[in-house]
């Protein structure tokens, strides 16, 4: 890995706890200021593998609300607007980091947690299993 | 929002700093133990809107490595394996939280940052702009 010289102005940390517990500033810096938020907002409807978005809320998690995609069809939408079962709609999943309150109900103490979320759907050629 | 009763066993926090700076345990709890990691590993090639995955590395960020998708084509792949320009391959993007070292190069002090990543691609009907 890359070795980074330590900044002498860093907060103190005791080696016995490092790097288990760190200080995190929750004032979010948003790097996405240049992007058009409407750009991909209608892809869920225009896709050949359309999906619905479902609200997943958990007050013990930060962020507390995550939107999850569920593919509408087993197949994909063809040029005629019908479901084509020669193809499959499948969810594109991604592992993301969230903060889990630990101990529970604590406002200022968290643990990092990795969760798998479905972001949208894509249309794939099915894997054909041939019988011997 | 939902009011959560505070756990009396929580670490102390001074109200003047709450909820700006919190303690986070970096020992990641992985909730994805039941998922098959290979399940969607080949969607990028089997999709009608195939994509390539590119490594985005930043030692000042946690996680330092993020994989980003780029659609291979302007159009989508049809049943004959050719690019169909009646459709568009578009990236499915998601805002995710990462930890940014702040001050820079500090091992135990971070700030939450929101970044936009492309997770995969989906095939959509293009928006047709008609000329008046």
């Amino acid at each position: 890995g890359i070795t980074i010289p330590r900044n002498p102005g860093c907060p103190n940390s005791e080696d016995k706890n490092f790097p288990r517990t760190v200080m995190v500033n929750l004032n979010i810096h948003n790097r996405n200021t240049n992007t058009n938020p409407k750009r991909s907002s209608d892809y869920y409807n225009r896709s050949t593998s359309p999906w619905n978005l479902h609200r997943n809320e958990d007050p013990e998690r930060y962020p507390s609300v995550i939107w999850e995609a569920k593919c509408r069809h087993l197949g994909c939408i063809n040029a005629d607007g019908n479901v084509d079962y020669h193809m499959n709609s499948v969810p594109i999943q991604q592992e993301i980091l969230v903060l889990r309150r630990e101990p529970p109900h604590c406002p200022n103490s968290f643990r990092l947690e990795k969760i798998l979320v479905s972001v949208g759907c894509t249309c794939v050629t099915p894997i054909v299993h041939h019988v011997a | 929002g939902i009011t959560i009763p505070r756990n009396p066993g929580c670490p102390n926090s001074e109200d003047k700093n709450f909820p700006r700076t919190v303690m986070v345990n970096l020992n990641i709890h992985n909730r994805n133990t039941n998922t098959n990691p290979k399940r969607s590993s080949d969607y990028y090639n089997r999709s009608t809107s195939p994509w390539n995955l590119h490594r985005n590395e930043d030692p000042e960020r946690y996680p330092s490595v993020i994989w980003e998708a780029k659609c291979r084509h302007l159009g989508c792949i049809n049943a004959d394996g050719n690019v169909d320009y009646h459709m568009n391959s578009v990236p499915i993007q998601q805002e995710i939280l990462v930890l940014r070292r702040e001050p820079p190069h500090c091992p135990n002090s971070f700030r939450l940052e929101k970044i936009l990543v492309s997770v995969g691609c989906t095939c959509v009907t293009p928006i047709v702009h008609h000329v008046a």
Epitope: N34 | N56, C71, R72, L74, G75, V83
Partner: antibody, heavy 124, light 108 residues
Framework: QVQLVESGGGVVQPGGSLRLSCAAS????????MHWVRQAPGKGLEWVSL????????YYADSVKGRFIISRDNSKNSLYLQMNSLRAEDTAVYYC?????????????????WGQGTLITVSS | SYELTQAPSLSVSPGQTANIICSGD??????VSWYQQKPGQSPLLVIY???RRPSGIPARFSGSNSGNTATLTISGTQTRDESTYYC???????????FGGGTKLTVL
Amino acid sequence: QVQLVESGGGVVQPGGSLRLSCAASGFTFDDHAMHWVRQAPGKGLEWVSLISGDGGATYYADSVKGRFIISRDNSKNSLYLQMNSLRAEDTAVYYCARHFSDSRGRSDVPFDIWGQGTLITVSS
Amino acid sequence: SYELTQAPSLSVSPGQTANIICSGDNLRTKYVSWYQQKPGQSPLLVIYQDTRRPSGIPARFSGSNSGNTATLTISGTQTRDESTYYCMTWDVDTTSMIFGGGTKLTVL
């Protein structure tokens, strides 16, 4: 070898029409989308239009939409650009260019082969 | 509509490295191609899909793309590299191909 040769350029009056041709050789023409790109004298490259391999899908830059028509005849390995209602700002060298995609969609290479270009001058 | 921005000119000495920059909103999410054009000639593809080099293009040409910036790097620049270089990407929102304004490279 792979080659694209444009023809049909010349001088035309504002409001007039012109048809450009591009003859392709050395590759399977209908496997690839094709483009027209233009370059005004002393200026940069400007994309004009795209047509899919089967000719069924076409797209245009806003600057030519409604005035230009891209077409192809795969039996003749030829690409065309019908230019109507020509304006002085359409004066440029017009290039045809191939958009390569392999048969299983593993790679995509826009404008991998270019023609030598043909000059259109719109002037009264 | 989407735009790509390039500096109009860049000068380097022979043997030096030339970094030709192309900027666009969130450009890292798109593939960028680069084209070399010498006066009176047709453009020539030198880099596609950010980093890939067509056969026949010298290894001193390389590409990268991160953040809002794509870079064409010519290491050990030679006098014959003196040309105008254009970056290009596609825009799915308008189904169009977008060229940068071009950078004229002078090898002094």
